[in-house]
């Protein structure tokens, strides 16, 4: 089944390389578990860049490894992702996915592109 | 245009075990992700189990975890989903369901097989 999922067009990084946006989902009913995953689409090529699954009222949990951060309030998730560079510019696309108790709904997002630029190095000073 | 086949579905005992493939032919592919479904007579689809291929990672719904198995062979196109200790609960149609990428939802399914647990 079907599901709107809502997410900013635009978002800057900051020039740590940081960019947050909120994924909002419109739930048909009263799910107690959750799966969202980012994607980035970039040159028609699309590519996941993390997932995490979460029990409603509870912290996301990703990999060890990831770069994504986030919380949850009730249907909005916080989505952060850390590390970027200019070359990681692209169309970030948030999936949801309302896992129990049935009936099973995915939905996704039109994207977020995510814009990111490398910081100028500073000028040694003499 | 491809088709997914599921098969190996039957009538078992409660307790014991069964092993469903899904094999995709139509093309050469790589597909994002493949899942199983299940839907009871009377009652709403479910989520089963699914393996995303980037990581091979797998993720199974809280009534199946420890006793299903999800697995795939990508050469073979086709993944299969072991059914240990089987409960009366878990008679249903299982669906098999592939996604070509991940913003594309599941574009294609099987016809299902029927799994029918006696007590």
């Known amino acids: 089944k079907a599901m709107h999922v809502a997410q900013p067009a635009v978002v800057l990084a900051s020039s740590r390389g940081i960019a947050s946006f909120v994924c909002e989902y419109a739930s048909p009913g009263k799910a107690t578990e959750v799966r969202v995953t980012v994607l980035r689409q970039a040159d028609s090529q699309v590519t996941e860049v993390c997932a995490a699954t979460y029990m409603m009222g509870n912290e996301l949990t990703f990999l060890d490894d990831s770069i994504c951060t986030g919380t949850s309030s009730g249907n909005q998730v916080n989505l952060t992702i850390q590390g970027l560079r200019a070359m990681d510019t692209g169309l970030y696309i948030c999936k949801v996915e309302l896992m129990y108790p049935p009936p099973y709904y995915l939905g996704i997002g039109n994207g977020t592109q995510i814009y990111v630029i490398d910081p100028e190095p500073c000028p040694d000073s003499d | 245009e491809v088709q997914l086949v599921e098969s190996g579905g039957g009538l078992v005992q409660a307790g014991g075990s069964l092993r469903l493939s899904c094999a995709a032919s139509g093309g050469t592919f790589s597909f994002y992700g493949m899942g199983w479904f299940r839907q009871a007579p009377g009652k709403e689809q479910e989520f089963v189990a699914d393996?995303?291929?980037?990581?091979?990672?797998?993720y199974y719904a809280d009534s199946v975890k420890g006793r299903f198995t999800i697995s795939r062979d990508n050469a073979k196109n086709t993944v299969y989903l072991q059914m240990n200790s089987l409960k009366p609960e878990d008679t249903a149609l299982y669906y098999c369901?592939?996604?070509?990428?991940?913003?594309?939802?599941?574009?294609?399914w099987g016809q299902g097989t029927q799994v029918k647990v006696s007590s």
């Open positions: 393996i995303r291929t980037s990581a091979g990672r797998t």
């Open positions: 369901a592939a996604e070509m990428s991940g913003i594309s939802g599941w574009d294609y």
